[in-house]
Interface confidence: low
Amino acid sequence: ARGPRCSQPGETCLNGGKCEAANGTEACVCGGAFVGPRCQDPNPCLSTPCKNAGTCHVVDRRGVADYACSCALGFSGPLCLTPLDNACLTNPCRNGGTCDLLTLTEYKCRCPPGWSGKSCQQADPCASNPCANGGQCLPFEASYICHCPPSFHGPTCRQDVNECGQKPGLCRHGGTCHNEVGSYRCVCRATHTGPNCERPYVPCSPSPCQNGGTCRPTGDVTHECACLPGFTGQNCEENIDDCPGNNCKNGGACVDGVNTYNCRCPPEWTGQYCTEDVDECQLMPNACQNGGTCHNTHGGYNCVCVNGWTGEDCSENIDDCASAACFHGATCHDRVASFYCECPHGRTGLLCHLNDACISNPCNEGSNCDTNPVNGKAICTCPSGYTGPACSQDVDECSLGANPCEHAGKCINTLGSFECQCLQGYTGPRCEIDVNECVSNPCQNDATCLDQIGEFQCICMPGYEGVHCEVNTDECASSPCLHNGRCLDKINEFQCECPTGFTGHLCQYDVDECASTPCKNGAKCLDGPNTYTCVCTEGYTGTHCEVDIDECDPDPCHYGSCKDGVATFTCLCRPGYTGHHCETNINECSSQPCRHGGTCQDRDNAYLCFCLKGTTGPNCEINLDDCASSPCDSGTCLDKIDGYECACEPGYTGSMCNINIDECAGNPCHNGGTCEDGINGFTCRCPEGYHDPTCLSEVNECNSNPCVHGACRDSLNGYKCDCDPGWSGTNCDINNNECESNPCVNGGTCKDMTSGYVCTCREGFSGPNCQ
């Protein structure tokens, strides 16, 4: 509600109302709890008197605020309590349906899940939401039909469509298709991108770096993201969780921010880390209504109400004008169970007993002035950045604790606020943004840009210099060209244009006319002033020694043709001749070409062989085969010149190896042995006691070493053992006891040994037998 002339004396807005100008007039804009031209009356609609969804309206009844109800369809009466005859009175909606009147005679039922129809009488086949994955359910003949979205099929849309089975494939340029429930996903090759790999991948276009990260290509398909503070990940997609190790106290919940965190405090705590108790009285100036005095408590507040008000927030009026004592000419207005003192200008308080301190505008401009209804003093509500009783003191935000400026920015206090003076390389209201100096591509000529704090550094390609690599290094600056050569500056090099007569990278060489090697055929060049002379090697002549002297004129070759060379000639001799000048006739017999004793006769570039009998061929190399008739019976035929020779097998003899040799002819068997002839051998049958091939040796019985401790002597059909001392028996295997004969005298003790004995003598005796 608005009332006119609220800025005039005596027309001030009460109970926290604000005076606002609109359409050329001034009026009080009241808070919800008060109404009236000057917000002087409690709002009668606050107690929601209109029932059955009736709407409450504030009305003016002879200057006093009252209410009137606008009833919903189907109800009437001052409080909308009287039902009118209407279509819903018969409860037409079944199965728990809610009846909504359209007109007094028409209704619409809001049916619970599982029911449909005009009166919710029909069971709804779609009530159980049988169609999955966003399928649309349509009732059909006591059942239902599901209309599935494109990615699903089947009676209840539960079967996934395999989009990867389509031909041609959805993923282009060699991308791999991965089927997913209700969808598909293309995994592209490094060279392409897009949902279907349809776009060529260009690093940083568009930039994949999120959250303000700066993208920089590192290759044809690779990039890197330089993230802003507070972000990380390959593409700066991850907000670094600043909550670990947070300082939120008293049950405060940490809420991660960008490169910072905040504490969400429970209602009774406040401050950056929930360490300050909430002063509800300061937080809510109207916590205690109707002039009640607010007392802050730990985790809450109490209201001490002024006389005539009660309740937790002093909102219940318990007084009236009958017992009222309105001061200083105030007018008392009667209320239901209350009274209201209408104060003259300059007075305030429930009974108009206080001077209104806000009249003198004690609060600094931009702040709100409220009068304390208890003591009439001004309560100034300060805007952000100001403090003090009159909001005239500037809050120094730079001294509150932690520097509000990030990255060592300098905090400068201003009236009602602060400013951050950032270090080079940072920007933003709180210096929170790292400036990427490489974004503007400051490095020229293919240089590499390194972003640094507050600056950048260009790594120049060879041949460039300067902060931006913009300067083509002047390699001519040091005047490198000698002998007045002209220097041409190039990229990362220089070139000298030399005057006539000089050459070289720096024109440092006097031109040597011999450098072009004008003298041919190995001639020596003598350089002269702007000329040269050729000293020819042997065999050449002419200015440049280009003419080969013909050594074949006159012809030096006797029996052959001449070939000219360099300072020489070569004679190609006719067959049968040799020598430097083909002057010597070759003796073809010198190599003794006639074999098997043939005689050689030299001819012109030829020879003739006269062969011995039994040989033939140009060189008498063919020996006629005299073995062709196989003349050797038991032997091998060896062909000879004009004959043969038989090499007999063992046991045969004769020129044709046809005679078996009798090996018994010489009586080889001795000591009465009998000889039996064989091929290439004989066998002796020896009498007893003899052996070996010719019965010369008798059997040596000593070969088996029968004598154990003695020497063996062989005899005819036997052997004899000569025993070692101390041993006896046929085979010398019996150890004799030499002590049996008592050899030790003079009381000596005898000890038998393997070979002999030992005497241990009594005192005074010695010797082998103690004798």
């Epitope: 290759g219 044809d220 990380t232 590499t448 390194l450 640094q452 550094q457 390609m461 060879p462």
Partner: antibody
Framework: EVQLVESGPGLVKPSETLSLTCTVS????????WSWIRQTPGKGLEWIGY???????NSNPSLKSRVTMSVDTSKNQVSLTLSSVTAADTAIYYC?????????WGRGTMVTVSS | QSVLTQPPSVSGAPRQRVTISCSGS????????VNWYQQLPGEAPKLLIY???LLPSGVSDRFSGSKSGTSASLAISGLQSGDEADYYC???????????FGGGTKLTVL
Amino acid sequence: EVQLVESGPGLVKPSETLSLTCTVSGGSMTSNFWSWIRQTPGKGLEWIGYVLYTGSTNSNPSLKSRVTMSVDTSKNQVSLTLSSVTAADTAIYYCARGNGWYLPWGRGTMVTVSS
Amino acid sequence: QSVLTQPPSVSGAPRQRVTISCSGSSSNIENNIVNWYQQLPGEAPKLLIYYDNLLPSGVSDRFSGSKSGTSASLAISGLQSGDEADYYCAAWDDSLKAVVFGGGTKLTVL
């Protein structure tokens, strides 16, 4: 995925020239730096230099007078020559993509300088 | 003597956290980006951290990098036996006009 393979003689005589080739497969050579790094027991990892796909080069000032690098994009090859070698040049020589950070690296090739 | 200084060796028990420091100067670490490499026995070095603190794809987020002034550090949490390797830091040096490496740190998992 880009792969790099270094090749060259394993033994070089003092005062001779060392020549190595790095063959690039699985990716394009353009828009990239191709670097050489060596590892010796005495000096650890040592940056030799890089050649850009355009042929521009930059090398370690301590080796500059002896180093030549080139690129042949048609053969997908990068080459390194180091002249007048001594025993101090005995090392594992690596080829790598990048300039500043290197990803990936080749397996490396061991070069011994000895007579 | 390397331009960037690293401790020759560090060790830690499985599941522990270790850090490897890399000390330089204003001509390298302070004014240039720092990169870290891991070299498993018998293998070539592999990029582990680049641009001071960024992870290449495929590298576990147990590895993290940080930089302050003329020093950088590599942190490895939840140590595993497979982390046993040599670790090298690297940066561009404005004075030497070259990429410089640390001497390497051998990590042993006890």
